[in-house]
Interface confidence: low
């Protein structure tokens, strides 16, 4: 008789997960000139260590603390690109403009980049078949605390101009719930951050409107400047030649708004 | 176009100096890691230092650690490799080469350096 | 640090295909490079990450890496395709970088 398991909502933890965690960590460390003393093997057993035999809906921030010391890393503070909603033109730009980095150009943000994972209470096992989802099931999951844990130290390390690109075609660019809008915003250290550059980046060819007086932005706006931390927008009009034009910025078409 | 050229080869005599400059063009210097890379006659590749992007971290062969110091200049665009107490197995011709990722997509020409008395 | 161990020398008829092998401990785990070099001239990038091949170089390289071993292949060997042979990965607990020792490919 097969042993009665708890079924989630969500998707359950990725194939290979263990091995995918490990061989993203040793590219990672190959990479990174300055993560090249990491053990990998020591980061995928503190990163097991967080879930493994655990109640996957009563995880805690403090449950990733070994794995947050191995995975220390210093980005350059003053050129951290935050996102929300708009992760794979935040990535394209990073990998262009490679002096900026958002929280999936670091070790642990590469390391867990669109997986899922989840264990069981008591058991050393990994649950492939269903993992707790944010809404259905409960925001203290595995994955949820991970990423919470790790925006909020990316955040609180950001200084002088830290920018964020926002997607103006959803219908709330700015999401207090979303991760940015949740956690990264009031992590932000006003001692340390002079301001914050808000990038909308349009989705239509034709869409010529400012998005940055959208409701949202408003709101944004009025988070951010209570916080004591200055705020400015940009419309980014066209994305694809806001790329090609950070490849090649001596282009004479890249003088013009984009 | 994308260009390496190393200079500052010739001969020296054993613990003697010399200092090796690779000027880069045609792309933004300090956005990339760059390596100096030798090869003795008729011999295979040996990498001898690595220096960050920034400036800030800096690897080198056991066989030179302590003789050899890698450095830049962003605002020149240039690489250097500072040689001191040469021996006559440093005989090699020196290529400096850009890193992109973990491979080098861009190498100079090379420049001959000879020790001997 | 890994030692990459090449043959050094390989030879092919013109049209067939050759085949480089790069052997180390665990190298599947690492990511190799290969670097085609001829006489009196600096060494060109062939493949990187594994199998990855640089704009302008021919379809016919192609790369893998598996278990020990990671392999260059040239497909429909070319008179031209006459040059040294080098791996190249990374020992990321020193920091250094390690070439293998180089294979003299020889088109008959």
């Known amino acids: 008789v097969p042993r009665w398991r708890q079924q989630w909502s969500g998707p359950g933890t990725t194939k290979r997960f263990p091995e995918t965690v490990l061989a993203r960590c040793v590219k990672y460390t190959e990479i990174h000139p300055e993560m090249r003393h990491v053990d990998c093997q020591s980061v995928w057993d503190a990163f097991k260590g967080a879930f493994i035999s655990k109640h996957p809906c009563n995880i805690t921030e403090e449950d990733y603390q070994p794995l947050m010391k191995l995975g220390t890393q210093t980005v350059p503070c003053n050129k951290i690109l935050l996102w929300s909603r708009i992760k794979d033109l935040a990535h394209q730009f990073t990998q262009v403009q490679r002096d900026m980095f958002t929280l999936e150009d670091t070790l642990l943000g590469y390391l867990a980049d669109d997986l899922t994972w989840c264990g069981e209470f008591n058991t050393s096992k990994i649950n492939y078949q269903s993992c707790p989802d944010w809404r259905k099931d409960c925001s203290n999951n595995p994955v949820s605390v991970f990423w919470k844990t790790v925006s909020r130290r990316f955040a609180e390390a950001a200084c002088d101009v830290v920018h964020v690109m926002l997607n103006g075609s959803r219908s709330k660019i700015f999401d207090k719930n979303s991760t940015f809008g949740s956690v990264e915003v009031h992590n932000l250290q006003p001692e340390k951050v002079q301001t914050l550059e808000a990038w909308v980046i349009h989705g239509g060819r034709e869409d010529s409107r400012d998005l940055c007086q959208d409701p949202t932005i408003k709101e944004l706006e009025s988070i951010i400047s209570k916080r004591n931390i200055q705020f400015s927008c940009k419309n980014i009009y066209r994305p694809d030649k806001f790329l090609q034009c950070v490849k090649n910025p001596e282009d004479s078409s890249c003088t013009s708004e984009i | 176009q994308v260009q390496l050229v190393e200079s500052g080869g010739g001969l020296v005599q054993p613990g003697g100096s010399l200092r090796l400059s690779c000027a880069a063009s045609g792309f933004t210097f300090s956005n990339y890691s760059m390596n100096w890379v030798r090869q003795a006659p008729g011999k295979g590749l040996e990498w001898v230092s690595y220096i960050y992007g920034g400036g800030s971290y800096t690897y080198y062969a056991d066989s030179v650690k302590g003789r050899f110091t890698i450095s830049r200049d962003n605002s020149k665009n240039t690489l250097y490799l500072q040689m001191n107490s040469l021996r006559a197995e440093d005989t090699a011709v020196y290529y400096c080469?850009?890193?992109?990722?973990?491979?080098?997509?861009?190498w100079g020409q090379g420049t001959l350096v000879t020790v001997s008395s | 640090d890994i030692e990459l161990t090449q043959p050094p020398s390989v030879s092919v008829a013109p049209g067939q295909t050759a085949r480089i092998s790069c052997s180390g401990d665990n190298l599947g785990s690492k990511v190799v490079s290969w670097y085609q070099q001829k006489p009196g001239q600096a060494p060109v990038l062939v493949i990187y990450?594994?199998?990855k091949r640089p704009s302008g170089i021919p379809e016919r390289f192609s790369g893998s890496n598996s278990g020990n071993t990671a392999t260059l292949t040239i497909s429909g060997t070319q008179a031209e395709d006459e040059a040294d042979y080098y791996c190249?990965?990374?020992?990321?607990?020193?920091?250094?970088?390690?070439f293998g020792g180089g294979t003299k490919l020889t088109v008959l």
């Open positions: 990450y594994d199998n």
């Open positions: 190249q990965s990374y020992t990321f607990e020193s920091g250094s970088v390690v």
């Open positions: 080469a850009r890193q992109a990722g973990m491979y080098f997509d861009v």
